[in-house]
Amino acid sequence: MSSKYPRSVRRCLPLWALTLEAALILLFYFFTHYDASLEDQKGLVASYQVGQDLTVMAAIGLGFLTSSFRRHSWSSVAFNLFMLALGVQWAILLDGFLSQFPSGKVVITLFSIRLATMSALSVLISVDAVLGKVNLAQLVVMVLVEVTALGNLRMVISNIFNTDYHMNMMHIYVFAAYFGLSVAWCLPKPLPEGTEDKDQTATIPSLSAMLGALFLWMFWPSFNSALLRSPIERKNAVFNTYYAVAVSVVTAISGSSLAHPQGKISKTYVHSAVLAGGVAVGTSCHLIPSPWLAMVLGLVAGLISVGGAKYLPGCCNRVLGIPHSSIMGYNFSLLGLLGEIIYIVLLVLDTVGAGNGMIGFQVLLSIGELSLAIVIALMSGLLTGLLLNLKIWKAPHEAKYFDDQVFWKFPHLAVGF
């Protein structure tokens, strides 16, 4: 059995990707320059470390987290890297055009790379719902549309709702989840007879998925604190995220055992639930004043995550065609919503405490912000799904879903691996 792309895609992918890369290079040539201001090297290194943490989260963490399929682990990791590399380039340009362009040129700083990496992370969260059912050419489209939609959402939220970088980037969880789910809903769903085993997890890929989860777990405090303005805010965000993810690990493992009739622990639950606390405290990580509150939120998030992993996959598989092990989409949609609700509850408590109508107005604004993020995610996701269904992309046939051999050369294997 030949391990090649169909001829048409073999022509389409390199042409499409390299033309796009050439266009990006030209845009960088004409419209960008580096920040030439004086910076001391020590400060520069410290600032770079946050960006490095985010890159590790994206490339290794999310790359390996999605690699648990028996026959699709290579593609999961490599396609994630491809999307990250492309997404960061486009996000830097887009953020620059949206926020700086009136001044003539886009100035690239370490902060803009940090922002771009976080924008690209959105795609890596979303793509979990469609990996295995799309080829690289389709993923390029998904990267471009999603990064563009997120960039515009952030600009609109910043201008209309007066939110800072941290607050508008923390919509990433909800945005990415709903974007991914709506793309998945548009793609062909049924797995034909005989291919069901491909979307099952295997021991070694599951181990690499756990490795991904560990990297995400270690670096989640960096993600939640990356865009905060002062050391005191960042310190609180790091502490609270750490407490929340620590408790969500304990909750995930014990909750997974509790949810199983024989008390066994599910790998799939644990992969995802260990991150629950970090997502749930994301929006308000710097606002939580004491460890016990962060820990309670981590506990609740862990329970919701395990509960969701137990009861939602059936529904997601039926309605959206998402395999049981791809639980990041609905996990993040639940936990992202929980995080947003926690922030809104803090505002409501302010309103009650102050008896101030203006703070009540802030609650409405926050609900409006969340609603806008969900609406834009769903609309842009549906648009992407429709685009991905176009014949020009030569999508893999349903019988070839979740199969590395469709995309990779395995000289030592004739069939399967």
Partner: antibody
Framework: QVQLVESGGGVVQPGRSLRLSCAAS????????MHWVRQAPGKGLEWVAV????????YYADSVKGRFTISRDNSKNTLYLQMNSLRAEDTAVYYC??????????????????????WGQGTTVTVSS | DIQMTQSPSSLSASVGDRVTITCRAS??????LNWYQQKPGKAPKLLIY???TLQSGVPSRFSGSGSGTDFTLTISSLQPEDFATYYC??????????FGQGTKVEIK
């Protein structure tokens, strides 16, 4: 004691460049964001730019965007403002100021309040042909 | 951007008078408002932050109030050293910090 000292002001022709410096002492410079604020003769205060404590992020007023660049060297405890393409309307006293933050909390939430708590004595920039 | 409007732009008062300066924001800024005092030829000085909290070392005759869009700076008993220009400043809409146009307090 806590102190900020600006330097580098002077008379310059329109279209030319100038670089202002602000030397900080008496506090941990690398833990604070820093601002430039200006005041045209007989006018009010106008915020110009801010840089985060680690230099990772910078913001500018629309009136100077693309012409002015704020930077810092934490190893030298110094803040800079590079001013290019100067115009007559840039004539002002330029102050550097420390971005101070304080936190208050109740049982469920932190509140962060910012202010400019330490100011330099100012340096005068005159743009004239 | 958020606009800050101070009133009056100047006022004359005598030592011992109670003085009130108001500041209005073009949209709600919660309590994210500061008051500064600037004497001629000097740098500004932070008086009040978070709309109503006195910065350390500031005399208790100064007080601030308000939330949302309307704020007030009150000097309960004007002293000779209080004759200066007062500015309000919002920082709700970061990354831009906006000052009011200033209120000059002069000796009657």
């Amino acid at each position: 004691q806590v102190q900020l000292v600006e330097s580098g002001g002077g008379v310059v022709q329109p279209g030319r460049s100038l670089r202002l410096s602000c030397a900080a002492s008496g506090f941990t410079f690398s833990s604070y964001g820093m601002h430039w604020v200006r005041q045209a003769p007989g006018k009010g205060l106008e915020w110009v730019a801010v840089i985060w404590y680690d230099g990772s992020n910078k913001y500018y007023a629309d009136s100077v965007k693309g012409r002015f660049t704020i930077s810092r060297d934490n190893s030298k405890n110094t803040l800079y403002l590079q001013m290019n393409s100067l115009r007559a309307e840039d004539t002002a006293v330029y102050y550097c100021a420390r971005d101070w933050v304080t936190r208050s909390s109740n049982w469920y939430r932190n509140y962060y309040y910012y202010g400019m708590d330490v100011w330099g004595q100012g340096t005068t920039v005159t743009v004239s042909s | 951007d958020i606009q800050m409007t101070q009133s009056p732009s100047s006022l004359s008062a005598s030592v011992g008078d109670r003085v009130t300066i108001t500041c209005r924001a073009s949209q709600s800024i919660s309590s994210y408002l500061n008051w500064y005092q600037q004497k001629p030829g000097k740098a500004p000085k932070l008086l009040i932050y978070a709309a109503s909290t006195l910065q350390s070392g500031v005399p208790s005759r100064f007080s601030g109030s308000g939330s949302g869009t309307d704020f007030t700076l009150t000097i309960s008993s004007l002293q000779p050293e209080d004759f200066a220009t007062y500015y309000c400043q919002q920082y709700y809409r970061t990354p831009t910090w906006t000052f009011g146009q200033g209120t000059k307090v002069e000796i009657k």
